[in-house]
Amino acid sequence: GDLLIQKTIKKQVVLEEGTIAFKNWVKTGTEVYRQFWIFDVQNPQEVMMNSSNIQVKQRGPYTYRVRFLAKENVTQDAEDNTVSFLQPNGAIFEPSLSVGTEADNFTVLNLAVAAASHIYQNQFVQMILNSLINKSKSSMFQVRTLRELLWGYRDPFLSLVPYPVTTTVGLFYPYNNTADGVYKVFNGKDNISKVAIIDTYKGKRNLSYWESHCDMINGTDAASFPPFVEKSQVLQFFSSDICRSIYAVFESDVNLKGIPVYRFVLPSKAFASPVENPDNYCFCTEKIISKNCTSYGVLDISKCKEGRPVYISLPHFLYASPDVSEPIDGLNPNEEEHRTYLDIEPITGFTLQFAKRLQVNLLVKPSEKIQVLKNLKRNYIVPILWLNETGTIGDEKANMFRSQVTGKIN
């Protein structure tokens, strides 16, 4: 009975040609959608002139189909029982699942101005940049279409800067026709408890973005976990989107299309300051913005973004300290809408449903020498957008799963 099932599961979750796991792993059978909500700034002039609170109004969802491309360069290594691959990126706009079109306009922070003033902090350099910003008629805020904001546009200020500056700017630029990886993961042939766990990412076991244990690449990519998941487990996974490994803990039993699954959630503790959670000390990379590492709920990933001052948080600054959201009006965080969860079928370890939620923010600081930032009296971590990436097992797949896995066990 049970032993036979265990044996079958162990065989079928191995990542090699011919298994159920492999087929779904190479190309996900689940439709994955990424919804975007853009934070439209309502008072750009008041912010720029008087350093007022930034009033934002979220607009969305704007929905794209993602993760529809099969993994590329899939290569088994029999010697160390790993399989390596690239995860290609692609996004297709879904008008029927969106509130508008990709041509909709938004008032957002000027990404290039904010980034350049942060990267080039020398006053002489800033004075030169100021002349370029003025010449290009750029300002602290800009109006951009959804397509431009997400996928890239030629920035007029950066276009005045000679080589070697990239003049195209976009929150996810470049995306289409690019790939994430190379990932090298254990295929589970020799040890099923290691299946899907990442061995190396881009040829390394560490990221080189953080100090100490924060820099480690832990666990899987969250699409699946080793089988026979226990409620007491802390599930580690790596997310290249946020340039770090993170973890999820059991929250509740859920019935998903007749399949019993465990809902694992990212706990607030994962976003806590080192004061609250000492393990997080190495995610605090500077002292000023973090108020001596007492702020929480935002992650400075600038080291992973070529120095651009990108901060990742949960949507609407959920689980973030009051000082972070204080300069921003119009945010309404709530757990149900804004937290991340994974619904995992415990026998196979497959993630059958998930909602990955995150917010992209940019730091903008006052600058004595840059006219459009001169009147700012404080630092702002400015929300640009938040996203909800979701996937749910299809009805057909769920039926197959029930009959072949959970049905047999019950």
Epitope: N122, I128, L160
Partner: antibody, heavy 122, light 107 residues
């Protein structure tokens, strides 16, 4: 090899103006900033200002704001500094110095001209 | 304006001895301090740039340290060819400002 060749010595009367040149070679003129530095006899160095030839953007030391004007001629890869209303305390050696403009934490005043002696005397 | 106080104004050492020059700034400039050597009749020559970075081709007997407001420039095993004026420059904020200089002589 990067070279900065400055114009020759100048003897000028008080109240007059002078324009010093700094001809560059061995690098892409528009990608480097050009600074000007004053050194009075037996004294220290003073930064006058800098210019970015690519777009003509300038930054001045307030002390020299009404004294010096920095310009460039991209066609001849030459930087100029004009000094006006000259007085005896403007007598000094004036240097041009240049640097590659890209990024923070890079060196300042890497390449220097040989200096131009300006003497203000009646 | 950030003022830079350089000391000593002059010093005389025997060859092989160690030289230490200090610059103190009136504001915190992180590690944005540069050091120059100026031999008689020549323009200054950059020895060490921001972040205590020894420039290519500069002998390793020259070094610097410091952060914030207090900076030290050192020559180990001074040679006769090191006779020159030495200047520090803060490049953190405008206007850039130089120290008053240190004249190094050999006994």
């Amino acid at each position: 090899e990067v070279q900065l060749q400055q114009s020759g010595p100048e003897l000028v009367k008080p109240g007059a103006s002078v324009k010093i040149s700094c001809k560059t070679s061995g690098y892409t003129f528009t990608e480097y900033t050009m600074h000007w530095v004053k050194q009075s006899h037996g004294k220290s160095l003073e930064w006058i200002g800098g210019i970015y030839p690519y777009n003509g953007g300038t930054a001045y030391n307030q002390k020299f704001k009404n004294k010096a004007t920095l310009t460039v001629d991209i066609s001849s890869n030459t930087a100029y500094m004009a000094l006006r209303s000259l007085a005896s305390d403007d007598s000094a050696v004036y240097y041009c110095a240049s640097d590659y403009f890209y990024g923070d934490g890079y060196p300042w005043f890497t390449y220097w001209g040989q200096g131009t002696l300006v003497t203000v005397s009646a | 304006e950030t003022t830079v106080t350089q000391s000593p104004a002059s010093l005389s050492v025997a060859t092989g001895e160690k030289v230490t020059i200090r610059c103190i700034t009136s504001t915190d400039i992180d590690d944005d301090m540069n050091w120059y050597q100026q031999r008689p009749g020549e323009p200054p020559n950059l020895l060490i740039s921001e972040g205590n970075t020894l420039r290519p081709g500069v002998p390793s007997r020259f070094s610097s340290s410091g952060y914030g407001t207090d900076f030290v420039f050192t020559i180990e095993n001074t040679l006769s060819e090191d006779v020159a004026d030495y200047y520090c420059l803060q490049s953190d904020n405008l206007p850039f400002t130089f120290g008053s200089g240190t004249r190094l002589e050999i006994k």
